[in-house]
């Protein structure tokens, strides 16, 4: 804590600028008004302050914004957010994609902070739901963003956001939470005709059940064997060798390089060994 | 760079209990998602088990009520306590560290046999 002491004359700051840099942490604290402070925050940025004197400005503005900081403020922080704990984020109501653009871009190329996660979250809660814009945003910064979130916190992200997943930010999801995304995903792309949905809904498909596979199977998708290494096994199970031959199209050769890995290996197993052998593959059920 | 150290595993009788543990070291960011996946000779990685960044949980339906995933956040550790074990539950344990950032890391493993 900065002692109060009096401004010396004509130290008096008028603007927030470079000579602030020589000031001492008690002539900042004396002679820098918050008001002014808070009004002219772009220019922080642009100033080389010391952590010491970033602390005495966001001291300033704590005296001055007891109930938590103005969006008007927050969207200037800059560097100053690096000061702010979760304890201070949690007052703040930010509306704007803009100030969350701003802020995520501060601590671009780093880990997620307690910070960022706390501003996050109360974005997102303010919003209501995890929209397409948010998730953009979002996903450009954390490409794991997606797959960090819970099958239950999944669940409430509306089919419309959907639009902004890219089949990169799904690569570290587990099986549960493509359970949840594959109906979203579904829901979002059903007006779209068969080869385009195949496209979007390709990234999806490790959550399909066996239906939707069996109705893949007559849109002549030619699924490559990638993504049929990753669909669920209990949903390719059922699936009948003809099916199956549908459903690969040109990529069915592939079977057999994959033939001891699952899902194949236990698809295999469960057909019988004449249909199998029309595939000509030399598959042994 | 994050690394990551499994134990706990060992060898144990049908219907009997172990707790693996997975300490993480590095940079993880905060609140990572760390997942339990196992490998059972001669087949494929598979998932076991999650802990989200809110610290919800999720399970594989073949170890569902009887596995147990839990974290101490303090000591950046996560845990798969094993009850009811059965042989099919043999394999190499792998725990996997996946930051927001998507970057993602695997332990070295640890090895659980159930006899009958």
């Known amino acids: 804590e900065v002692e109060k002491t009096a401004c010396p004359s004509g130290k008096k700051a008028r603007e927030i600028d470079e000579s602030l840099i020589f000031y001492k942490k008690w002539e900042l604290e004396a002679c820098v008004d918050a008001a002014l402070l808070a009004t002219q925050m772009d220019r922080v940025n642009a100033i080389p302050f010391t952590y010491e004197q970033l602390d005495v400005l966001k001291h300033k503005l704590d005296e001055l914004y007891p109930q938590g900081y103005p969006e008007s403020v927050i969207q200037h922080l800059g560097y100053l957010f690096l000061k702010m704990s979760p304890e201070d984020i949690r007052k703040w109501n930010v509306t704007s994609l803009e100030t969350l653009k701003a802020l995520l871009e501060v601590n671009k190329g780093h880990e997620m902070s307690p910070q960022v996660a706390t501003l996050i979250d109360r974005f997102v809660k303010g919003r209501g739901q995890l929209d397409k814009d948010t998730l953009d945003t979002l996903t450009a910064f954390y490409p794991g963003y997606l797959c960090s979130l819970s099958p239950e916190e999944l669940s409430s992200v509306p089919p419309s956001s959907i639009w902004a997943v890219r089949p990169q930010d799904l690569d570290t999801c587990d099986p549960r939470q493509l359970d949840v995304l594959y109906p979203k995903a579904r829901l979002a792309f059903q007006n779209m005709n068969g080869s385009e949905y195949f496209v979007k809904i390709q990234s999806f498909l490790g959550g399909a059940p066996t239906e939707d596979l069996k109705a893949l199977s007559q849109q002549n998708v030619s699924m490559d064997l990638a993504t049929f290494m990753k669909l669920r096994t209990d949903a390719v199970l059922p699936l009948t060798v003809a099916e199956v031959q549908k459903l690969l199209g040109p990529h069915v050769e592939g079977l057999k390089a994959e033939e001891r890995h699952r899902p194949v290996r236990d698809w295999i197993l469960r057909q019988r060994q004449d249909d199998l052998d029309t595939l000509g593959l030399g598959l042994q059920g | 760079q994050v690394h990551l150290m499994e134990s706990g595993g060992g060898s144990v009788q049908a219907g009997g209990s172990l707790r693996l543990s997975c300490v993480a070291s590095g940079d993880t960011g905060y609140q990572p998602t760390m997942r339990w996946y196992r490998q059972a000779p001669g087949k494929e990685r598979e998932f076991v088990s999650a802990?989200?960044?809110?610290?919800?949980?999720s399970y594989a339906d073949s170890v569902k009520g009887r596995f147990t995933i839990s974290q101490d956040n303090a000591r950046k550790t996560v845990y798969l306590q094993m009850a009811s074990l059965k042989p099919e539950d043999t394999a190499m344990y792998y725990c996997?560290?996946?930051?927001?950032?998507?970057?993602?890391?695997w332990g070295q493993g640890t090895q659980v046999t159930v006899s009958s």
């Open positions: 802990i989200y960044s809110d610290q919800t949980t």
């Open positions: 996997k560290l996946t930051t927001r950032r998507g970057s993602e890391y």
